[in-house]
């Protein structure tokens, strides 16, 4: 999902800006930055979240806020501190003139400031409700465990908690932080105010139309009667959850955020902090038929972001728009004509559509999985959600062409049994943001903190790239792809796996002098090869073909072009075994694939040879895909021959551990 330096408007207020009337840069240390929503109508100028540096204490936050007020007063400006944050992010929410931003950015401890902006419920119809009875037989769906050990927090509108579908299942907290409704003639009708939240609570835990019928819920009101809220209100809600968790630790927590606003650094940061405190966050991808990475909290990497599909597993169209898509989406779930509790009456049902409904499905599935296995980490849960999803059922033609390869073709499903998946080696594919077209541009893909990067590949639509390499960053391996001169940009593709007690390292061989090609192998005892990468400095690799792809008896070896440096990912983990599988096609072809067989998991995917007509390699579920330039442009020379190389692994240790449990 979105990198921290996300694609949104960032104003570094170091130089004078005419628009905001700003002066010189801060005196000390690094420059604090100002951020605002890229979508102008959603901006809320006059209210700002001042985020302080990570280690700032509450007393320092309060002091900084008072200092801002005092300095503003000296300049004749009134300010109001609306909230002081602590527990999740240090900082404060302030109502003030934009003229004071320059002053605020110079305050001690300030990391960045973000202008407040709107967030919105992600369902339609908002008030065109159809009252319908549940359209199924209840005994068709009776899950083994209804999520009874899990608490699901819902940040949404007010809800009708005594609706027959959810009575006794939802505790309405006293938390409320919503903006005034728009329009002077707005009539606040209770049933409409409750519509969105009631429906979603029903989808998660409703007695008859719910996914996790045993889950208990707590609701926080962050959206008003028009389904509109603010980033700041959502932040304060997330902080409330964190404080509740600290005061009274319970079992696993799932937080459902069925809302979306423009990209927000601060909202994403808060989600990251809460996720790292052990909370599972599930959010709507957004209903804008757009790249989910442009929205928050959808773009937060730690959040499980859900797009919407219909009964035919096709992406949901919502009026002129539809579900969001792209690399920031983790998976899709049912989100069209979803039956759930209607706030029109205490026994009414209604169908609503949107990525909110899809996210509610996944929150319900997550609650059931966590109830069955309460010790699951966020990374383990995400991997299981992906693993048990229906694969390759979505018609990708609905997505823009450039987004198809980035969008996961996964529709959420309940596991056949909520237990017994522990023996599996789980892996997922993580795409980076696009590098951009400059000559030295790079793109970085990262795994979650408790995942292992087992391989790294790259992809460029133009084919102009300089490969990829695994490198250490902050004590963790990342996957970096390199653009080439004249290239339109590259993607880095990380293969991120759950491998307990793993010890992985990267072995590099520099470009070979001889014509034999470059090779590198895993020489440490007990280490197996999980992935191969190659990176080159020359603009265009020649047509050199390694004479021998892989000498017999040396499966732990990466081979590549003589002008490229080759990187082998070598891992030691209990019971880990891997094998190399190749599929070569002598004639030129736009796509070559090779898949791992049942019981084995794809950890590495690369192409041989690494010549410039190869666009790149990437993993889709358990299949390694190598893409080449259009055959009409390469002709049918031997250069067109491409081999897809998959590295397939399994863990005997995990399998044994699982058998001992059963």
């Amino acid at each position: 999902q979105e990198d921290e330096d996300g694609d949104y408007e960032e104003l570094v207020l170091a130089l004078r800006s005419e628009e905001d009337g700003l002066a010189e840069a801060p005196e000390h240390g690094t420059t604090a930055t100002f951020h605002r929503c890229a979508k102008d109508p959603w901006r809320l100028p006059g209210t700002y979240v001042v985020v302080l540096k990570e280690e700032t204490h509450l007393s320092q936050s309060e002091r900084t806020a008072r200092r801002l007020q005092a300095q503003a007063a000296r300049r004749g400006y009134l300010t109001k501190i609306l909230h002081v944050f602590h527990g999740l992010l240090p900082g404060f929410l302030v109502k003030m003139s934009g003229d004071l931003l320059e002053l605020a950015l110079k305050l001690p401890h300030v990391d960045y400031i973000e202008e407040d902006s709107s967030v919105f419920a992600q369902s339609i119809p908002w008030n065109l409700e159809r009252i319908t009875p549940p359209r199924y037989r209840a005994d068709e769906y009776q899950p083994p465990d209804g999520g009874s050990l899990v608490e699901v927090y819902l940040l949404d509108t007010s809800i009708q908690s005594d609706h027959r579908e959810i009575e006794g299942r939802v505790m309405v907290t006293d938390f409320e932080n919503v903006p005034e409704e728009d329009g002077t003639r707005f009539h606040r009708q209770a049933s409409k105010c409750d519509s969105h939240g009631t429906h979603l609570a029903g989808v998660v835990s409703g007695r008859d139309a719910g996914v996790a019928k045993g889950a208990s819920m707590r609701s926080l009101r962050v959206l008003n009667c028009q389904g509109k809220g603010t980033v700041s209100g959502t932040l304060i809600g997330l902080e409330f959850i964190r404080k509740s968790q600290l005061v009274q630790p319970v079992g696993p927590l799932v937080v459902l955020l069925p809302l979306a606003g423009g990209y927000s650094r601060v909202l994403n940061a808060a989600c990251q902090r809460l996720a790292r405190a052990g909370v599972v966050l599930v959010t709507a991808a957004g209903n804008f038929r757009d790249d989910a990475c442009l929205y928050s909290p959808a773009s937060a990497p730690e959040v499980i972001t859900v797009g919407a599909t219909n009964a035919q597993d096709q992406p949901v169209t919502l009026g002129t728009l539809g579900t969001n898509f792209g690399r920031c989406v983790d998976l899709f779930a049912p989100g069209e004509d979803i039956i759930g509790a209607s706030s029109d009456c205490s026994t009414c049902f209604v169908s609503q559509s949107g990525t909110s409904q899809a996210a509610a499905h996944v929150a319900g599935i997550a609650a059931m999985m966590l109830s069955a296995e309460p010790e699951l980490t966020l990374a383990e849960l995400r991997q299981r959600l992906i693993h048990f999803s229906a694969k390759d059922v979505i018609n990708e033609a609905w997505f823009p062409e450039d987004q198809r390869v980035l969008t996961p073709n996964l529709v959420a499903a309940l596991p056949p049994s909520t237990h017994g998946a522990g023996w599996q080696l789980f892996c997922r594919t993580v795409w980076s943001a696009h590098s951009g077209p400059t000559r030295m541009a790079t793109a970085v893909a990262r795994c979650a903190p408790d995942e292992e990067l087992l391989s790294c590949s790259s992809f460029s639509r133009s084919g102009k790239r300089r490969g990829e390499r695994m490198e250490a960053q902050g004590g963790k391996l990342v996957c970096r792809a390199h653009n080439a001169f004249g290239g339109e940009g590259v993607y880095a593709i990380a293969r991120c796996c759950l491998l307990p007690q793993a010890n992985c390292s990267v072995h590099t061989a520099p470009p070979a002098e001889a014509s034999m090609g470059t090779r590198v192998h895993c020489h440490q005892q007990g280490h197996v090869l999980t992935g191969c990468s190659s990176h080159w400095e020359v603009e265009d690799l020649g047509t050199h073909k390694p004479p021998v792809l892989r000498p017999r008896g040396q499966p732990n070896q990466c081979v590549g072009h003589r002008e490229a440096s080759i990187h082998a990912s070598c891992c030691h983990a209990p019971g880990l075994e891997c094998k190399v599988k190749e599929h070569g096609i002598p004639a030129p072809q736009e796509q070559v694939t090779v898949a791992c067989e049942e019981g084995w998991t794809l950890t590495g995917c690369s192409a041989l040879p690494g010549t410039s007509h190869v666009l790149g390699a990437y993993a889709v579920d358990n299949t390694c895909v190598v893409r080449s330039r259009d055959v009409s442009t390469t002709g049918s020379t031997s250069e067109g021959a491409v081999t897809a190389v998959a590295i397939c692994c399994r863990s005997r240790h995990l399998a044994q551990a699982s058998q001992e449990l059963q």
Epitope: A138, E167, G168, M171, V172, R207, K213, T347
Partner: antibody, heavy 115, light 109 residues
Framework: QVQLVQSGAEVKKPGASVKVSCKAS????????ISWVRQAPGQGLEWMGW????????NYAQKLQGRGTMTTDPSTSTAYMELRSLRSDDTAVYYC????????WGQGTTVTVSS | QSALTQPASVSGSPGQSITISCTGT?????????VSWYQQHPGKAPKLMIY???NRPSGVSNRFSGSKSGNTASLTISGLQAEDEADYYC?????????FGGGTKLTVL
């Protein structure tokens, strides 16, 4: 603990009205409505309707439409059931119960309609 | 709304198991997960024994169990005891209301 306490027995003449109260305690009021159920002597249970503490909404059994009114007063945590134009076949024990799930019941209020 | 159909009476000896059936339609029992069973001793208020087809509230003996197949729900009491002698009522959601069964008198011989 969760409790529903009902008002005392009533004796009414045919054509009169009766108003039975039910005071709730020990739980979050707005998470549940109140169901009203009656039981005529020697007969089974009959669901009469439901009323919300959250917004005052009601859901009446068809048989009761027009003759009964259910209300709540959240400030006193009390639900009320009023039955008008009483007939002798309204003689019964009237129970309030928590929500549609009816997991907790009041002790019952005997209403006798007799001339 | 017509009442759900229950046998008027069932009996069993101490230690035995008995089952009480509750038959409705696809618009009530068959259409919802919300079938409940209540026990009522003479002169007392009903007590919830089973909710949502097969769940037992805390404090209710595990000798009581519930199930459902199609439009018929069942209450099974195993290891029958003298104190189990009472009237038993089933209850189900309908699309807009609630409906009870006519009741079953359980006699422990």
């Amino acid at each position: 603990q969760v409790q529903l306490v009902q008002s005392g027995a009533e004796v009414k003449k045919p054509g009169a009205s009766v108003k039975v109260s039910c005071k709730a305690s020990g739980y979050t009021l707005t998470s549940y409505g109140i169901s009203w159920v009656r039981q005529a002597p020697g007969q089974g249970l009959e669901w009469m309707g439901w009323v919300s503490f959250y917004n005052g909404n009601t859901n009446y059994a068809q048989k009761l439409q027009g003759r009964g009114t259910m209300t709540t007063d959240p400030s006193t945590s009390t639900a009320y059931m009023e039955l008008r134009s009483l007939r002798s076949d309204d003689t019964a024990v009237y129970y309030c119960a928590r929500g549609y799930g009816m997991d907790v019941w009041g002790q019952g209020t005997t209403v006798t309609v007799s001339s | 709304q017509s009442a759900l159909t229950q046998p008027a009476s069932v009996s069993g000896s101490p230690g035995q198991s008995i089952t009480i059936s509750c038959t409705g339609t696809s618009s009530d029992v068959g259409g919802y997960n919300s079938v409940s069973w209540y026990q009522q001793h003479p002169g007392k208020a009903p007590k919830l024994m089973i909710y949502e087809v097969s769940n037992r509230p805390s404090g209710v003996s595990n000798r009581f169990s519930g199930s459902k197949s199609g439009n018929t729900a069942s209450l099974t009491i195993s290891g029958l005891q003298a104190e189990d002698e009472a009237d038993y009522y089933c209850n189900s959601y309908t699309s807009t209301s609630m409906v009870f069964g006519g009741g079953t008198k359980l006699t422990v011989l």
